[in-house]
Protein backbone atom coordinates (compact mmCIF):
# COMPACT_ATOMS: atom_id res chain seq x y z
CA UNK A 1 0.00 0.00 0.00
CA UNK A 2 0.79 3.55 -0.27
CA UNK A 3 -0.24 6.84 0.48
CA UNK A 4 -1.71 8.97 -2.11
CA UNK A 5 -2.75 12.88 -1.53
CA UNK A 6 -5.26 14.99 -4.37
CA UNK A 7 -4.71 17.93 -6.12
CA UNK A 8 -6.91 20.13 -8.22
CA UNK A 9 -4.70 21.48 -10.94
CA UNK A 10 -5.19 24.53 -13.61
CA UNK A 11 -3.51 24.71 -16.93
CA UNK A 12 -3.94 27.02 -20.09
CA UNK A 13 -2.84 25.26 -23.33
CA UNK A 14 -0.36 26.81 -24.59
CA UNK A 15 1.80 27.36 -27.42
CA UNK A 16 3.50 24.03 -27.32
CA UNK A 17 0.16 22.53 -25.80
CA UNK A 18 -0.49 20.99 -22.71
CA UNK A 19 2.24 19.32 -22.62
CA UNK A 20 1.82 15.75 -21.49
CA UNK A 21 1.58 11.88 -22.32
CA UNK A 22 -0.76 9.55 -21.01
CA UNK A 23 -1.41 5.71 -20.71
CA UNK A 24 -3.91 4.06 -19.43
CA UNK A 25 -7.65 2.76 -20.31
CA UNK A 26 -10.10 -0.22 -19.56
CA UNK A 27 -8.27 -1.38 -22.97
CA UNK A 28 -4.75 -0.45 -21.82
CA UNK A 29 -4.39 -0.84 -18.81
CA UNK A 30 -0.74 0.06 -17.72
CA UNK A 31 -1.10 -0.55 -13.67
CA UNK A 32 -2.13 -4.16 -12.67
CA UNK A 33 -5.87 -4.29 -12.26
CA UNK A 34 -6.03 -0.13 -12.56
CA UNK A 35 -7.78 0.89 -15.93
CA UNK A 36 -7.01 4.77 -14.66
CA UNK A 37 -5.14 7.15 -16.74
CA UNK A 38 -1.93 8.13 -15.88
CA UNK A 39 0.91 10.23 -16.75
CA UNK A 40 3.78 8.77 -18.47
CA UNK A 41 5.57 11.71 -20.07
CA UNK A 42 5.74 15.43 -19.24
CA UNK A 43 7.50 17.60 -22.13
CA UNK A 44 10.37 19.83 -21.00
CA UNK A 45 8.62 23.44 -22.42
CA UNK A 46 4.54 22.31 -22.42
CA UNK A 47 2.16 24.10 -19.75
CA UNK A 48 2.18 20.94 -17.18
CA UNK A 49 5.83 21.68 -16.70
CA UNK A 50 5.89 25.65 -16.60
CA UNK A 51 3.25 24.66 -14.06
CA UNK A 52 5.13 22.47 -12.05
CA UNK A 53 3.32 20.45 -10.09
CA UNK A 54 2.14 17.46 -12.58
CA UNK A 55 4.49 14.78 -11.92
CA UNK A 56 4.76 11.69 -14.08
CA UNK A 57 3.08 8.81 -12.56
CA UNK A 58 0.11 10.97 -11.50
CA UNK A 59 -3.22 9.56 -11.87
CA UNK A 60 -5.81 11.85 -14.11
CA UNK A 61 -8.99 11.61 -12.14
CA UNK A 62 -11.24 14.06 -14.00
CA UNK A 63 -10.55 16.31 -16.95
CA UNK A 64 -12.99 19.66 -16.58
CA UNK A 65 -15.15 17.94 -14.06
CA UNK A 66 -15.48 14.56 -16.16
CA UNK A 67 -14.30 11.71 -14.50
CA UNK A 68 -12.08 9.35 -16.55
CA UNK A 69 -13.08 5.86 -14.88
CA UNK A 70 -14.14 3.26 -17.34
CA UNK A 71 -13.00 4.74 -20.59
CA UNK A 72 -11.03 3.55 -23.35
CA UNK A 73 -7.83 4.68 -24.20
CA UNK A 74 -8.75 6.59 -27.70
CA UNK A 75 -11.27 8.09 -25.81
CA UNK A 76 -9.31 9.51 -22.55
CA UNK A 77 -6.65 10.54 -25.55
CA UNK A 78 -9.69 12.80 -27.41
CA UNK A 79 -11.14 14.04 -23.89
CA UNK A 80 -7.47 15.81 -23.25
CA UNK A 81 -7.35 17.28 -26.99
CA UNK A 82 -10.49 18.84 -26.88
CA UNK A 83 -10.61 19.78 -23.40
CA UNK A 84 -10.21 23.78 -24.47
CA UNK A 85 -7.93 26.39 -23.46
CA UNK A 86 -8.56 26.13 -19.53
CA UNK A 87 -8.09 22.59 -18.31
CA UNK A 88 -8.84 21.34 -14.98
CA UNK A 89 -7.33 18.31 -13.73
CA UNK A 90 -8.25 16.42 -10.77
CA UNK A 91 -4.49 14.18 -9.83
CA UNK A 92 -3.75 11.88 -7.34
CA UNK A 93 0.05 11.79 -6.51
CA UNK A 94 1.39 9.18 -4.55
CA UNK A 95 3.55 10.06 -1.68
CA UNK B 1 13.94 1.30 -23.36
CA UNK B 2 12.90 1.05 -27.08
CA UNK B 3 15.51 -0.12 -29.72
CA UNK B 4 14.39 1.47 -33.60
CA UNK B 5 15.88 0.13 -36.69
CA UNK B 6 14.51 1.38 -40.13
CA UNK B 7 14.77 0.44 -43.41
CA UNK B 8 13.39 0.97 -47.03
CA UNK B 9 15.06 4.23 -47.92
CA UNK B 10 16.67 4.10 -51.49
CA UNK B 11 16.31 6.45 -54.56
CA UNK B 12 13.45 7.05 -55.92
CA UNK B 13 11.96 9.16 -59.30
CA UNK B 14 9.76 12.24 -58.51
CA UNK B 15 6.06 10.93 -58.47
CA UNK B 16 7.19 7.49 -57.26
CA UNK B 17 6.25 5.78 -53.63
CA UNK B 18 8.49 4.06 -51.46
CA UNK B 19 7.17 1.93 -47.94
CA UNK B 20 9.65 3.19 -44.39
CA UNK B 21 9.36 0.27 -42.03
CA UNK B 22 10.58 0.72 -38.38
CA UNK B 23 11.01 -2.17 -36.25
CA UNK B 24 11.03 -1.95 -32.51
CA UNK B 25 12.59 -4.26 -29.81
CA UNK B 26 11.12 -4.57 -26.63
CA UNK B 27 7.51 -5.55 -24.41
CA UNK B 28 4.60 -3.29 -24.41
CA UNK B 29 4.38 -1.92 -28.34
CA UNK B 30 1.02 -0.56 -28.59
CA UNK B 31 1.91 1.57 -25.02
CA UNK B 32 4.01 3.83 -27.79
CA UNK B 33 3.31 6.79 -29.84
CA UNK B 34 5.23 6.29 -32.80
CA UNK B 35 6.24 8.79 -35.38
CA UNK B 36 8.66 9.83 -38.14
CA UNK B 37 10.92 12.87 -38.96
CA UNK B 38 12.86 14.02 -41.25
CA UNK B 39 16.08 15.97 -41.54
CA UNK B 40 17.49 17.15 -44.60
CA UNK B 41 20.84 19.12 -44.95
CA UNK B 42 21.66 21.79 -42.99
CA UNK B 43 17.98 21.80 -41.55
CA UNK B 44 16.65 20.64 -38.26
CA UNK B 45 14.64 17.85 -37.92
CA UNK B 46 11.24 18.23 -39.15
CA UNK B 47 7.71 15.97 -38.06
CA UNK B 48 6.29 14.45 -40.86
CA UNK B 49 3.45 11.60 -39.07
CA UNK B 50 2.50 9.87 -36.25
CA UNK B 51 0.32 7.25 -35.08
CA UNK B 52 -1.16 6.23 -31.11
CA UNK B 53 -0.29 2.90 -29.54
CA UNK B 54 -3.95 1.85 -31.00
CA UNK B 55 -3.58 2.79 -34.43
CA UNK B 56 -6.49 5.33 -33.70
CA UNK B 57 -4.70 8.46 -33.55
CA UNK B 58 -2.99 9.69 -36.87
CA UNK B 59 -1.13 13.09 -37.46
CA UNK B 60 0.23 14.38 -40.52
CA UNK B 61 2.71 17.69 -41.10
CA UNK B 62 0.62 19.45 -44.25
CA UNK B 63 3.46 18.89 -46.50
CA UNK B 64 2.70 15.11 -46.80
CA UNK B 65 -1.25 15.12 -45.99
CA UNK B 66 -2.85 13.49 -48.44
CA UNK B 67 0.57 11.49 -49.78
CA UNK B 68 1.89 9.78 -46.73
CA UNK B 69 0.41 7.22 -44.86
CA UNK B 70 1.45 6.55 -41.36
CA UNK B 71 0.31 2.26 -40.34
CA UNK B 72 1.66 0.13 -37.68
CA UNK B 73 0.85 -3.86 -36.68
CA UNK B 74 1.18 -3.96 -32.91
CA UNK B 75 1.98 -7.51 -33.32
CA UNK B 76 4.91 -7.25 -35.50
CA UNK B 77 6.62 -4.49 -32.94
CA UNK B 78 6.39 -2.27 -36.55
CA UNK B 79 5.66 0.85 -37.78
CA UNK B 80 5.47 1.81 -41.56
CA UNK B 81 5.49 4.88 -43.47
CA UNK B 82 4.04 4.54 -46.83
CA UNK B 83 5.04 7.68 -49.20
CA UNK B 84 3.97 7.90 -52.57
CA UNK B 85 3.68 11.21 -55.36
CA UNK B 86 7.42 11.80 -53.81
CA UNK B 87 8.70 15.32 -54.22
CA UNK B 88 12.43 15.97 -54.50
CA UNK B 89 11.72 18.67 -51.44
CA UNK B 90 11.02 14.67 -49.51
CA UNK B 91 14.66 13.98 -49.54
CA UNK B 92 16.12 13.59 -46.57
CA UNK B 93 16.92 10.95 -43.78
CA UNK B 94 13.98 9.76 -42.50
CA UNK B 95 14.26 8.99 -38.72
CA UNK B 96 11.45 6.67 -36.54
CA UNK B 97 10.74 7.73 -33.07
CA UNK B 98 9.13 7.18 -29.79
CA UNK B 99 7.42 7.79 -26.77
CA UNK B 100 5.75 6.27 -24.32
CA UNK B 101 1.41 6.99 -23.83
CA UNK B 102 -0.41 9.71 -26.11
CA UNK B 103 0.34 12.91 -26.55
CA UNK B 104 -2.56 15.14 -24.69
CA UNK B 105 -1.95 17.82 -27.62
CA UNK B 106 -2.75 16.80 -31.22
CA UNK B 107 0.18 16.67 -33.73
CA UNK B 108 -0.25 20.50 -34.56
CA UNK B 109 2.19 20.86 -31.72
CA UNK B 110 4.42 18.49 -32.05
CA UNK B 111 8.33 18.18 -32.32
CA UNK B 112 11.56 15.91 -31.81
CA UNK B 113 12.01 16.82 -28.33
CA UNK B 114 8.20 15.32 -27.61
CA UNK B 115 10.05 11.81 -28.52
CA UNK B 116 12.53 10.21 -26.72
CA UNK B 117 13.87 6.99 -28.66
CA UNK B 118 15.42 7.65 -31.99
CA UNK B 119 16.43 5.14 -34.81
CA UNK B 120 19.66 5.75 -36.83
CA UNK B 121 17.50 6.82 -39.88
CA UNK B 122 17.14 5.64 -43.40
CA UNK B 123 18.19 7.72 -46.62
CA UNK B 124 15.47 9.14 -48.87
CA UNK B 125 16.50 10.25 -52.23
CA UNK B 126 13.99 11.46 -55.20
CA UNK B 127 15.64 12.51 -58.10
CA UNK B 128 13.98 15.14 -60.75
Known amino acids: DYLVTEEEINLTRGPSGLGFNIVGGTDQQYVSNDSGIYVSEIDENGAAALDGRLQEGDKILSVNGQDLKNLLHQDAVDLFRNAGYAVSLRVQHRL | DVQLVESGGGLVQAGGSLRLSCAASGRTFSSYTMGWFHQAPGKEREFVAEIGGTGGNTGYADSVKGRFTISRDNAKNTVYLQMNSLKPEDTAVYYC?????????????????????WGQGTQVTVSE
Open chain 2, 97 to 117: AAVIGSPTDSSDYRSSLDYDY
